[in-house]
């Protein structure tokens, strides 16, 4: 019996040697093999010289082969598809001379830290290039100059802080660009040129909205139907455009497209199309905590196949998913044109949710199943995932308040006693003076700790008479199935086991589409501001009031008129009754 299974597809002999515990190439491979599957073996190293006699070979699949090195000295003149995903490659050799016919190259989920300028030299037929989920911190100028026929490019979930100007020059046929989940703060002026680019993914970056973002903002305004939010398992063509998924990290996650840009010089090419009224901004101090079980476990769900640790990829999110409905078992399903992701993860927008749903993920990997999603739970009942008390990170975000005289307090229950039970929000009460509130600064490990100091961002705040505070109480008793308002006692943070989040009711600066995150894995602002620990610029914070039409109509309290007092979303006193995830 031969080592591998043989079949034929579209006139090509297909040889399947997947998961055969091979440490080297089988000796009995058919000479006329056209498609060769070697995935899920333990090859360690691979060279094109192994296959030089396989003159019909057009597709070669080497994913999950524990590859640490690849050599491409011998020519495989007919090879069109090369899948090297989910390996341990730290560098990519020049493939152009050996593989001139290559049309699809997948090197996703490896450990590529950089690419040489000539890495793609000679790959003039390349149509699809997948580099997502690596450790790429920068790209060399002219990287894509040789690949003029490129249709699909994925650079998602890397550590890119900037993109080289002209990266896309000459890529006239490019139709899909994945840039989500990086550390990008802006897009170079003229970056998109005149490219049509029907599908672009830009969410989950640290976009910094200042005058330098105007080119990008204008491009978003002019191309709102080209910007999409990644949904796992959904074909790109079936997704709906979502330009609001691109958010300003420094402006309370306001959509970049609506950034006013007031006071910026109106240069040719990034004309300020919008004329918004001047709005005050406030400074926010964000202190990140790390090394918690809840933190690690949650990211573990996203990073099951990532080659780097969760903590080293603070913002490098994979395509965003819905909370898992059960504890994950990392079986994988192939997604055409994209690399595999755990199939327990459903598509979601945890980072930038535009729907309002109840989170269902328990961060701790216990045997208990995560809370099932109630069919029609009111919005006020959104529970926070249950971490262990000792593992809850402390996050302090003081914000200056215009009218701090009597700001309400929200106690959000952390524990959901039963899957069916619904927590009870408490009636707000005034909080004590801010001086009595502990605000520890817990440093976050940085990718390059030796060279990068950990700054704390100064917070110029007026002396408020009463600072608002959100606190998280101890687990609530078993509540009834309907939310009930109760009169609480004053709750103050007592130890670092409880996250205290200081936020204020700032008058709305922009009225834009921003609904609650669909899951709250750690604390809300830690998720929204999962930045590289050394923040490049001071974060500015504004509270954005969601538009009524952007929310799930079943879950939103309806108002009969749109006056501030009758519409709960326009009522400044109403803000703090909502669960923290709503903001």
């Amino acid at each position: 019996q031969p080592t591998c299974d043989v079949s034929k597809v579209t006139s090509l002999l297909e040889v399947n040697c997947e998961d055969k515990k091979l440490k080297k190439l089988p000796t009995d491979l058919p000479a006329d093999t056209g498609i060769l599957h070697l995935s899920k073996n333990q090859l360690g190293t691979f060279s094109t010289s192994y296959l030089v006699h396989f003159t019909h070979l057009t597709h070669l699949y080497l994913s999950r082969c524990e590859l640490t090195s690849l050599q491409a000295h011998e020519k495989l003149l007919k090879l069109e598809t090369l899948d090297l995903s989910h390996n341990h490659l730290q560098s990519l050799p020049s493939l152009g001379r050996a593989l001139p016919a290559l049309t699809t190259l997948d090197v996703s989920f490896n450990k590529l830290g950089s690419l040489s300028p000539g890495a793609l030299e000679g790959l003039g037929q390349l149509e699809e290039l997948y580099l997502q989920n690596n450790d790429l911190k920068s790209l060399p100028p002219g990287l894509l100059m040789p690949t003029t026929k490129l249709l699909k490019l994925s650079l998602a979930n890397n550590k890119l802080r900037e993109l080289p100007p002209g990266l896309l020059d000459g890529l006239e046929d490019l139709d899909t660009l994945y840039l989500q989940g990086n550390w990008l703060s802006t897009i170079p002026k003229g970056f998109f040129g005149s490219l049509l680019l029907p599908f672009v993914f830009l969410h989950a970056n640290t976009w910094y909205c200042d005058c330098e973002i105007l080119y990008f903002r204008n491009w978003l305004q002019e191309n709102p139907n080209r910007v999409y939010l990644w949904k796992e398992g959904v074909d790109v063509k079936a997704m709906t455009a979502n330009v609001a998924s691109v958010r300003c990290a420094n402006l309370g996650n306001a959509p970049v497209y609506s950034y006013p840009g007031k006071g910026c010089p109106t240069n040719e090419g990034d004309i300020d199309y919008d004329d918004y009224a001047d709005t005050p901004t406030t400074r926010t101090e964000v202190k990140f905590s790390t090394n918690t079980k809840a933190h690690t476990t949650y990211w573990g769900l996203f990073y099951s196949e990532s080659s780097t640790s969760p903590d080293s990829q603070m913002t490098s999110l994979p395509p965003i998913h819905e909370p898992t409905k059960k504890q994950p078992t990392f079986a994988h399903t192939e997604i055409p044109g994209f690399t595999t992701l755990p199939d327990t993860m459903e598509s979601n927008t945890a980072f930038y949710s535009l729907n309002n749903t109840v989170p269902t993920t328990t961060p701790e990997p216990t045997s208990t199943q995560a809370t099932p999603e109630p069919s029609s739970t009111p919005m006020l009942t959104t529970p926070v995932p249950t971490p262990e008390p000792s593992s809850i990170p402390m996050l302090t975000v003081p914000v200056s308040t215009p009218e701090p005289s009597s700001t309400p307090m929200l106690t959000t229950p952390v524990s959901t006693p039963e899957p069916s039970s619904i927590p009870m929000p408490t009636i707000p009460v005034p909080t004590p003076e801010p001086s009595s509130i502990p605000m520890p600064t817990i440093p976050v490990p940085t990718p390059e700790p030796s060279s990068t100091p950990m700054p704390t961002i100064p917070v110029p705040t007026p002396e408020p008479s009463s600072t608002p505070m959100f606190t998280t109480p101890v687990p609530t008793p078993e509540p009834s199935s309907t939310p009930m308002l109760t009169t609480p006692t004053l709750t103050t943070p007592e130890s670092s086991s409880t996250p205290s989040i200081l936020v204020s009711t700032i008058p709305p600066v922009l009225t834009t589409t921003l609904a609650p995150p669909e899951s709250i894995p750690k604390t809300v602002l830690e998720q929204f501001y999962t930045l590289e620990p050394t923040l490049p610029r001071t974060l500015e914070s504004t509270i954005i009031i969601p538009e009524q039409n952007s929310l799930n109509s079943q879950a939103v309290p309806q108002a009969s008129s749109d006056t501030p007092k009758s519409n709960p979303f326009l009522n400044s006193d109403f803000c703090c009754l909502l669960p923290l995830g709503f903001y």
């Epitope: 597809v9 006139s11 058919p30 000479a31 006329d32």
Partner: antibody, heavy 118, light 113 residues
Framework: QVQLVESGGGLVKPGGSLRLSCAAS????????MSWIRQAPGKGLEWVSS???????YYPDSVLGRFTISRDNAKNSLYLQMNSLRAEDTAVYYC????????????WGQGTLVTVSS | DIQMTQSPSSLSASVGDRVTITCKSS????????????LAWYQQKPGKAPKLLIY???TRESGVPSRFSGSGSGTDFTLTISSLQPEDFATYYC?????????FGQGTKVEIK
């Protein structure tokens, strides 16, 4: 002209073995993939096995491990070794040629009947 | 495996009639790389071996009369005999040659009315 002539059919008991042959002429045998296709009495066509011009065999699950296809290019012959025969293997067995690397069958033999019965 | 379903299983027609036989596959037979649909049609007369009529959905084998034509894409295919001739009374089979195992439809028997 292309000719394919099958032989070796007959009556065999369940569990028994039989070897079919197909003599090819009128074309460069070594350059073509060859196949066996069968047709149970009064039924439709069912693919049994193929062998590429380079000699790589492949089979459907229904016969995998029981049937073995082979070729002898020097003799312009195709073979099908059938072991562990079952009643459901009863059929007319056709030898057929494939066009190039494609997998439709442009020439067929007249067929040989294999009957598996106790 | 790809399942092939032909309809009707039999039909009665007269000489000169236009006859249409359909074949459905359980998955697409379109190869996006070359835009070809991997479907073939055969004619078989009683006691004889099948004869190739059409491959790649619509390409007529040499020597096959022009009254035979094939069409379709993806999962739905049609064999049309524009004007039925006496020698066309036979059983017709479709076959997918997209991926092994190669599978055939159950056949459509065209009988004289």
């Amino acid at each position: 002209q292309v000719q394919l002539v099958e032989s070796g059919g007959g009556l065999v008991k369940p569990g028994g073995s039989l070897r079919l042959s197909c003599a090819a002429s009128g074309f460069t045998f070594s350059s073509f993939a060859m196949s066996w296709i069968r047709q149970a009495p009064g039924k439709g066509l069912e693919w049994v096995s193929s062998i590429t011009s380079a000699g790589t065999p492949y089979y459907p699950d229904s016969v995998l491990g029981r049937f073995t296809i082979s070729r002898d290019n020097a003799k312009n012959s195709l073979y099908l070794q059938m072991n562990s025969l079952r009643a459901e293997d009863t059929a007319v067995y056709y030898c057929a040629r494939s066009r190039g690397y494609e997998d439709y069958f442009d020439y067929w033999g007249q067929g040989t009947l294999v009957t598996v019965s106790s | 495996d790809i399942q092939m379903t032909q309809s009707p299983s039999s039909l009665s027609a007269s000489v000169g009639d236009r006859v249409t036989i359909t074949c459905k596959s359980s998955q697409s037979l379109l190869n996006s790389r070359n835009q070809k649909n991997y479907l073939a049609w055969y004619q078989q007369k009683p006691g004889k071996a099948p004869k190739l009529l059409i491959y790649f959905t619509s390409t007529r084998e040499s020597g096959v009369p022009s009254r035979f034509s094939g069409s379709g894409s993806g999962t739905d295919f049609t064999l049309t005999i524009s004007s039925l001739q006496p020698e066309d009374f036979a059983t017709y089979y479709c076959q997918q040659h997209y991926s092994s195992p190669w599978t055939f439809g159950q056949g459509t028997k065209v009988e004289i009315k």
